[in-house]
């Protein structure tokens, strides 16, 4: 009985042609949606003139279907028991699951104006950039449509730079027709306890973004884990969205469409300051904004974004220190709505349901030489949007799963 099931599981979770795992791995059978909530700034002039608190009002959800494309360039390497691939990116707007259209407008931070003095911390160049910002009539805030903000728009200020630079700006630009990877993962053929664990990403075993062990690529991509998951296990996974490896711990047992699953959650200490969690010391890469590494709940991923001042957090600054959220009004963090979780079927290690929640923020600092920013009296980590990416096993697949896996065990 049990030995036969274990043998079957070990055979079927291997990532090679013909297995159950491989078929679902190449192209997920789960419909994955990414919902966006945009933080619409209510008092842009007051902030730019008086350095007031930024009043935001979230608007959403605006929903896109994502992860519907099959993995490409799948290549097995029998020598080291790995399989490599790229994951194509694509997003299709779902009007019926959205509160408005892609043409809805929002007042948000001017991404280029905020980023330019951060990238060019040179007073001479800032004077030059100020001339361009003024000429283009750009200011600290801008009004952009959802489509522009997410997927890119031609920035009028950057368009004046008389050199061949990229003038398109967008939170996720470029996205459509791009790929994530190359990933190289263990196929589990020689050792099932390594199945789906990432061996390398973009040809490297480290990210080159963080010092020390923070730079390691740990675990899987969170779509599955090695089988026979125990509650005591810490699930480690790498997320290219946040440019780091992270982990989840057991939270509770859940019944998902008749399938018993373990809900693993991202613990608060994953976002803690080095003061609270010494393991996080290497995620604190600058001392000023982080108040000498005492702030928590935000991750500076600038090194991973060509030096742009991008900070990742949980939505509404959940689990973030008061100094981070204090300059922003209108945030209401809520554990249930804003945490990330993975519902993992413990026998196979397959993630059957998940909710990945994160917030994209941009740092804007006072800049004496740039008129649009010269009245600021303090730096702000400005929330731009938050997203909720969810997937749940379909009813048909759930029935099949019960028949083939959990039913047999019962």
């Amino acid at each position: 009985g049990d030995m036969l099931i274990e043998k079957t599981i070990k055979r079927e979770v291997v990532l090679e042609e013909g297995t159950t795992a491989f078929k679902n791995w190449v192209k997920t059978g789960t419909t994955v949606y990414r919902q966006f909530w945009i933080f619409d700034v209510q008092n842009p002039d007051d902030v730019a003139k008086n350095s007031s608190k930024i009043k935001v009002k979230q608007r959403g959800p605006y929903t896109y279907r994502v992860r519907y494309l099959a993995k490409e360039n799948i290549t097995q390497d029998p020598e080291d028991h790995t399989v490599s691939f790229v994951q194509p990116n694509g997003a299709i707007f779902e009007p019926s699951l959205s509160v408005g259209t892609e043409d809805d407008n929002f007042t948000v931070l001017n991404l280029a104006v905020a980023a330019a003095p951060h990238i060019y911390q040179n007073s001479f160049v800032q004077v030059v950039l100020n001339s361009l910002i003024k000429k283009s009539k750009s200011s600290m805030f801008q009004t952009r449509s959802l489509k522009e903000l997410l997927w890119g728009y031609k920035d009028p200020f950057l368009s004046l730079v008389p050199y061949p630079i990229s003038t398109t700006v967008g939170v996720f630009y470029p996205y459509n027709d791009t790929v994530d990877g190359v990933y190289k993962v263990f196929n589990g053929k020689d050792n099932i306890s390594k199945v789906a664990i990432i061996e390398s990403y973009k040809g490297k075993r480290n990210l080159s973004y963080w010092p020390s062990y923070c730079d390691m690529i740990n675990g899987t991509d969170a779509a599955s884990f090695p089988p026979f998951v125990e509650k005591s296990r810490t699930l480690r996974f790498f997320s290219s969205d946040i440019c780091r490896s992270i982990y989840a711990v057991f939270g509770s047992e859940i019944d998902l469409k008749g399938i018993p699953v373990y809900r693993f959650v991202l613990p608060a200490n994953a976002f803690a300051s080095p003061l609270q969690n010494p393991d996080n010391h290497c995620f604190c890469t600058e001392k000023v904004i982080s108040n000498n590494c005492t702030s928590y709940g935000v991750l500076d991923i600038g090194k991973c974004k060509e030096g742009k001042p991008v900070y990742i957090s949980l939505p509404h600054f959940l689990h973030a220190s008061p100094d981070v959220s204090e300059p922003i009004e209108g945030l209401h963090p809520n554990e249930d709505e804003h945490r990330t979780y993975l519902d993992v079927e413990p026998i196979t290690g397959f993630t059957l349901q998940f909710a990945k929640r994160l917030q994209v923020n941009i740092l804007v600092k006072p800049a004496r030489k740039i008129e649009a920013l010269k009245n600021l009296k303090r730096p702000y980590i400005v929330p731009i949007l938050w997203l909720n990416e969810t997937g749940t096993i379909g009813d048909e697949k759930a029935e099949m799963f019960k028949t083939q896996v959990t039913g047999k065990i019962k």
Epitope: N122, V127, N130, S131, L132, K134, K135, L160, P162, Y163
Partner: antibody
Framework: EVQLVESGGGLVQPGGSLRLSCAAS????????IHWVRQAPGKGLEWVAW????????YYADSVKGRFTISADTSKNTAYLQMNSLRAEDTAVYYC??????????WGQGTLVTVSS | DIQMTQSPSSLSASVGDRVTITCRAS??????VAWYQQKPGKAPKLLIS???SLYSGVPSRFSGSGSGTDFTLTISSLQPEDFATYYC?????????FGQGTKVEIK
């Protein structure tokens, strides 16, 4: 092809005035801004004045502040340096130069200004 | 104002020699340093920007290094056409300032 051509140099008495011109071709001065840099005989290079892009602000070395004025006529793609109250120590070859990020990638051939009685 | 101090003020070298010119800024200018070559009666020519970035068309025997306050221009194998005066310049803060120059002469 990018080119800068200075003109207007010559001999002038102390206290006198002179206007130098810098005609640009192959790029628009509006987009880059223009600098003037001078070199006294047998000496090193000294930055003098700058007009930032798009009719932006103007900046001057302390040694010429209040006496020299930089300007540009974008329709002619030409920059000017109006030099008043000239002194013997202003004697130099004056170069106009193109810069965006603060280094000078193109220079004119220079025009000699001699201040002497 | 940021002072740029170049050394030596002059040097004698032979064709094929490796030549090093240094430049020290009076305060941190990160990597915002350019190097120029000037021949008598001619305008300066840009060699290097951002301390290390070779300008297009400049021979690869020229290289720049350094960041913060200390910078170096190296000519790996001196050629006859390299005998000239070399200037460093900081492009970090206005006013833009130059070093006093280093004259490279034939030994």
């Amino acid at each position: 092809e990018v080119q800068l051509v200075e003109s207007g140099g010559g001999l002038v008495q102390p206290g006198g005035s002179l206007r130098l011109s810098c005609a640009a071709s192959g790029f628009t001065i509006d987009a880059f801004g223009i600098h003037w840099v001078r070199q006294a005989p047998g000496k090193g290079l000294e930055w003098v004045a700058w007009i930032a892009p798009y009719g932006g602000d103007t900046y001057y070395a302390d040694s010429v502040k209040g006496r020299f004025t930089i300007s540009a006529d974008t329709s002619k793609n030409t920059a000017y340096l109006q030099m008043n109250s000239l002194r013997a120590e202003d004697t130099a070859v004056y170069y106009c130069a193109r810069s965006f990020f603060g280094y000078f990638d193109y220079w004119g051939q220079g025009t000699l200004v001699t201040v002497s009685s | 104002d940021i002072q740029m101090t170049q050394s030596p003020s002059s040097l004698s070298a032979s064709v094929g020699d490796r030549v090093t010119i240094t430049c020290r800024a009076s305060q941190d200018v990160s990597n915002w340093v350019a190097w120029y070559q000037q021949k008598p009666g001619k305008a300066p020519k840009l060699l290097i920007s951002y301390a290390t970035s070779l300008y297009s068309g400049v021979p690869s025997r020229f290289s720049g290094s350094g960041s913060g306050t200390d910078f170096t221009l190296t000519i790996s194998s001196l050629q006859p056409e390299d005998f000239a005066t070399y200037y460093c310049q900081q492009h970090s803060n206005a006013p833009l300032t130059f070093g006093q120059g280093t004259k490279v002469e034939i030994k």
